[in-house]
Interface confidence: medium
């Protein structure tokens, strides 16, 4: 028996359902009584879901997995993972045994889009050209880690005096805070771009300083 899975990682958004595709080619006369199907975490060998002795043995992994029972006889051994969490990310191995056995691994990449950045300025009043200001760009609840880019009003990258930190919350999602320290010109726009490298999603924020008032 030959097992086939998708070579590319499966990308799933947090809190959505994902299908880890796995298939095999049943011989003529194949019946489910002959099938032993096991899904497990590749690294730890933890059992995720199994079908043995002619029946679905159910989820061994937080009760969020399911097979496609009506499609098993056609060779579809795919696994449905519901309400995906960050902690589900990783490699899953599909083992199929009929008379002989084969296995293959499929990777699950979890992702979550970042919120539109909020911009704060310190100090935020009595600003004059030549003043040193701190601009903070904050974006929330994304996954995986963000890449953060700063640009001035002419689109020139600002790389000096930038400090970016990322904090994982209880769900494993990241809040990103990027701080730019810059000397004010006569006026200017400062933009921050927060990029999710898996989703290729960009979230933009900017602040324009033209004396008073400030524009966000």
């Amino acid at each position: 028996v030959e097992v086939q899975v998708s070579e590319d990682p499966v990308v799933a958004l947090v809190d959505t359902d994902a299908t880890l595709r796995c298939s095999f080619s049943p011989e003529p006369g194949f019946s489910l009584a002959q099938l032993n199907l096991i899904w497990q975490l590749t690294d730890t060998k933890q059992l995720v879901h199994s079908f043995t002795e002619g029946r679905d043995q159910g989820s061994a992994y937080s009760n969020r997995t399911a097979l496609f029972p009506d499609l098993l006889v056609q060779g579809n051994a795919s696994l449905r993972l519901q309400r995906v969490r960050v902690t589900d990310e990783g490699s899953y191995t599909c083992f199929v045994s009929i008379q002989d056995f084969d296995s293959a691994a499929v990777s699950l990449q979890v992702a979550a889009p970042y919120s539109k950045p909020s911009m704060t300025l310190e100090p935020n009043k009595d600003l004059r050209p030549g003043n040193m200001v701190t601009i903070t760009c904050s974006s929330y609840q994304g996954y995986p880690e963000a890449e953060v880019f700063w640009k001035d009003g002419q689109g020139v990258p600002l790389t000096g005096n930038v400090t970016t930190s990322q904090m994982a919350n209880e769900r494993g999602l990241f809040d990103v805070h990027s701080v730019l320290r810059v000397v004010l010109g006569a006026n200017g726009t400062y933009s921050c771009l927060v990029r999710n490298p898996v989703l290729q999603q960009d979230a933009h924020g900017s602040v324009t300083i033209t004396g008073q008032p400030l524009t966000f």
Epitope: G90, Q109, P144, E145, M167, A168, F174
Partner: antibody
Framework: DVQLVESGGGVVRPGESLTLSCAAS????????VSWVRQAPGEGLEWVSG???????YYADSVKGRFTISRDNSNNTLYLQMNSLRAEDTAVYYC??????????????WGLGTLVTVSS | EVVLTQSPGTLTLSPGERATLSCRAS??????LAWYQQKPGQAPRLLIY???TRATGIPARFSGSGSGTEFTLTINSLQSEDFAVYYC??????????FGGGTKVEIK
């Protein structure tokens, strides 16, 4: 079996450059976050730089602008390019694998380390 | 940056005794804390992660507890191979990942 083997350490003068390598086996390097952690003689552990599975790079403030982390997925190797070396960079440099692509950033596997000595 | 402070710096005990090592974080890191053991001339070895979970192959005499800012590694009935330096590490707020300064457990 997961294995990490560092190489490229040696003795250099202040201001010079050095590139460290970490050959990984038993796992795919772009499926995990991998870091460089150093330990100065008789001192504690200091995280230096890391790269996530998705390719996002991180640096400690003490090396930002001087060190560059990279990886070659085709030969499953991690690198640390160290420029403008200083005496305080003298340490054993360990390559360490996180147990996840990103966020669970504790280190479940470590190499044996390679010694970098910066001295005039 | 989250600063981790380990105490005591050195713990002098006899085999069979219980070792209690402390790690304090400068702000809450929930339960995102790991413990490592390091012997002279060797790389660190993961003991505990997520504050309480023992890594693969780590004996049951090692246990972790705590949350927020106060964490403890307990070694029940010290064996000769347990005399080493122990480091805590946080992975909640980063970069940078930060380590404590270490506690040396030495034989009395």
């Amino acid at each position: 079996d997961v294995q990490l083997v560092e190489s490229g350490g040696g003795v250099v003068r202040p201001g010079e450059s050095l590139t460290l390598s970490c050959a990984a086996s038993g796992f795919t390097i772009n499926s995990y976050a991998v870091s460089w952690v150093r330990q100065a003689p008789g001192e504690g552990l200091e995280w230096v730089s890391g790269i996530s599975g998705s390719g996002v790079r991180y640096y400690a403030d003490s090396v930002k602008g001087r060190f560059t982390i990279s990886r070659d997925n085709s030969n499953n190797t991690l690198y640390l390019q160290m420029n403008s070396l200083r005496a305080e960079d003298t340490a054993v440099y360990y390559c360490a694998r996180s147990n996840k692509v990103t966020w669970n950033n504790f280190f479940d596997y470590w190499g044996l380390g390679t010694l970098v000595t910066v001295s005039s | 940056e989250v600063v981790l402070t380990q105490s005591p710096g050195t713990l002098t005990l006899s085999p069979g005794e219980r070792a209690t090592l402390s790690c304090r974080a400068s702000r809450s890191i929930l339960t995102s804390l790991a413990w490592y053991q390091q012997k002279p001339g060797q790389a660190p070895r993961l003991l505990i992660y997520n504050t309480v979970t023992r890594a693969t192959g780590i004996p049951a005499r090692f246990s972790g507890s705590g949350s927020g800012t106060e964490f403890t590694l307990t070694i029940n009935s010290l064996q000769s191979e347990d005399f080493a330096v122990y480091y805590c590490q946080q992975y909640y707020d980063w970069p940078p990942l930060t380590f404590g300064g270490g506690t040396k457990v030495e034989i009395k």
